[in-house]
């Protein structure tokens, strides 16, 4: 499993992982105590046939070509959690590992 | 976690799982001994904001709105394997559990 990494200067048109810092403060999400911001990353780019396909299923659907099936799209294929300290809405503060907050790899599915 | 299930008569425009039988024989894939066909299913439909989003990350990227980020797309969020009997190209016949061959659930990511 591998995926492309790009940045804002890249000319890559294919499915790629780009850097993105999410700033909770800028969103006005004051219920999040920590972190104030974190590196989330995101996926963008084109999914030509077979390029970076995560699943054999993607290839099979392309072959079968059913009504209404779109081509594969560039989406996270590997994600990781971050630890957050936050108000849970019941006057409690919770420390928790929140899953799927960081994109580690992008692919076509 | 949940996802919508549709069929060919559905009028649902949102991200949905549709039935699809993959027929290896029809593809001419004679190196697959069994199964000859199986229910693979596929995902199709629109991903309006927040609907069936699998990850909190999807919502955060929408908020941050970086250059070139497409909206979320309708893609498998839960998949399962099938057992297959096949020629492996080295004159051997293999029985194996092939991952991610069946779409169990669709969502927006």
């Amino acid at each position: 499993d591998f995926g492309l990494d790009c940045d804002e200067h890249s000319t890559e048109s294919r499915c790629c992982r780009y850097p993105l810092t999410v700033d909770f403060e800028a969103f006005g999400w004051d219920w999040i105590i920590a972190p104030k911001r974190y590196k989330a990353n995101y996926c963008s780019g084109e999914c030509e046939f077979v390029f970076l396909q995560k699943y054999p299923h993607t290839h099979l659907v392309h072959q079968a070509n059913p009504r209404g099936s779109a081509g594969p799209c560039c989406t996270p294929t590997k994600m990781s959690p971050i630890n957050m300290l936050y108000f849970n809405g019941k006057e409690q503060i919770i420390y928790g590992k929140i899953p799927a907050m960081v994109v580690d790899r992008c692919g076509c599915s | 976690d949940f996802g919508l299930d549709c069929d060919e008569h559905s009028t649902e425009s949102r991200c949905c799982r549709y039935p699809l039988t993959v027929d290896f024989e029809a593809f001419g894939w004679d190196w697959i001994i069994a199964p000859k066909r199986y229910k693979a299913n596929y995902c199709s439909g629109e991903c309006e904001f927040v609907f069936l989003q699998k990850y909190p990350h999807t919502h955060l990227v929408h908020q941050a709105n970086p250059r070139g980020s497409a909206g979320p797309c309708c893609t498998p969020t839960k998949m399962s394997p099938i057992n297959m009997l096949y020629f492996n190209g080295k004159e051997q016949i293999i029985y194996g559990k092939i991952p991610a061959m069946v779409v169990d659930r669709c969502g927006c990511s």
């Epitope: 403060e25 006005g28 004051d30 219920w31 105590i33 920590a34 972190p35 104030k36 630890n83 300290l85 108000f87 809405g89 006057e91 409690q92 503060i93 919770i94 420390y95 928790g96 590992k97 | -």
Partner: antibody, heavy 116, light 107 residues
Framework: EVQLLESGGGLVQPGGSLRLSCAAS????????MSWVRQAPGKGLEWVST????????SYPDSVKGRFTISRDNSKNTLYLQMNSLRAEDTAVYYC?????????WGQGTLVTVSS | DIQMTQSPSSLSASVGDRVTITCRAS??????LNWYQQKPGKAPKLLIY???SLQSGVPSRFSGSGSGTDFTLTISSLQPEDFATYYC?????????FGGGTKVEIK
């Protein structure tokens, strides 16, 4: 340099009220949650309250809930603790602290004595 | 409420000694454990957060480890300015609670 300066402590009778203040400087006050922690003479540390950066969310332990109210004025870079129905067991040095994953900066504290 | 138990409650050590303080939580708290140092008449100072992350400006002789219920603060080579009381604190869920403290004295 982060600085937190508490004030408002003093001697108060049981059942009385007191309002503590914490003046913050050296960081963007409105960006951080803030906490109060107290320490009874010769004893350990006890968490008293926390407020979110915008002031929308608060949390308290049962020992002070309903009697103490934390608030903040981001335009004045000041944190407050309104203490009502004070008891002898509330006697302590009260510290304000800048809150991140942990309380990463503390003031020098202000002494509150509840006694008749 | 989550109870935090520190041990020992006090210890005597010499300059240059390796010192270990332990903290045990009454239930699993993941890595939501912080360590503070307090000198007489002074405010506490954060040393370690999230079990093992060194706070900015804190000397590298301080280190933290552990997850779940058992945690350790280690001072690799005790310095004269390290004689103080050390507290652990859980930030896993409110009410946040502190250990009873460990007083590190000069032998």
């Amino acid at each position: 340099e982060v600085q937190l300066l508490e004030s408002g402590g003093g001697l108060v009778q049981p059942g009385g009220s007191l309002r503590l203040s914490c003046a913050a400087s050296g960081f963007t006050f409105s960006s951080y949650a803030m906490s109060w922690v107290r320490q009874a003479p010769g004893k350990g540390l006890e968490w008293v309250s926390t407020i979110s950066s915008g002031g929308s969310y608060t949390s308290y332990p049962d020992s002070v809930k309903g009697r103490f109210t934390i608030s903040r004025d981001n335009s004045k870079n000041t944190l407050y603790l309104q203490m009502n129905s004070l008891r002898a067991e509330d006697t302590a040095v009260y510290y304000c602290a800048k809150q991140d994953y942990a309380m990463n900066y503390w003031g020098q504290g202000t002494l509150v004595t509840v006694s008749s | 409420d989550i109870q935090m138990t520190q041990s020992p409650s006090s210890l005597s050590a010499s300059v240059g000694d390796r010192v270990t303080i332990t903290c045990r939580a009454s239930q699993s708290i993941s890595t939501a454990l912080n360590w503070y140092q307090q000198k007489p008449g002074k405010a506490p100072k954060l040393l370690i957060y999230a079990a093992s992350s060194l706070q900015s400006g804190v000397p590298s002789r301080f280190s933290g480890s552990g997850s779940g219920t058992d945690f350790t603060l280690t001072i690799s080579s005790l310095q004269p300015e390290d004689f103080a009381t050390y507290y652990c604190q859980q930030s896993y869920s409110t009410p946040w609670t502190f250990g009873g403290g460990t007083k590190v004295e000069i032998k």
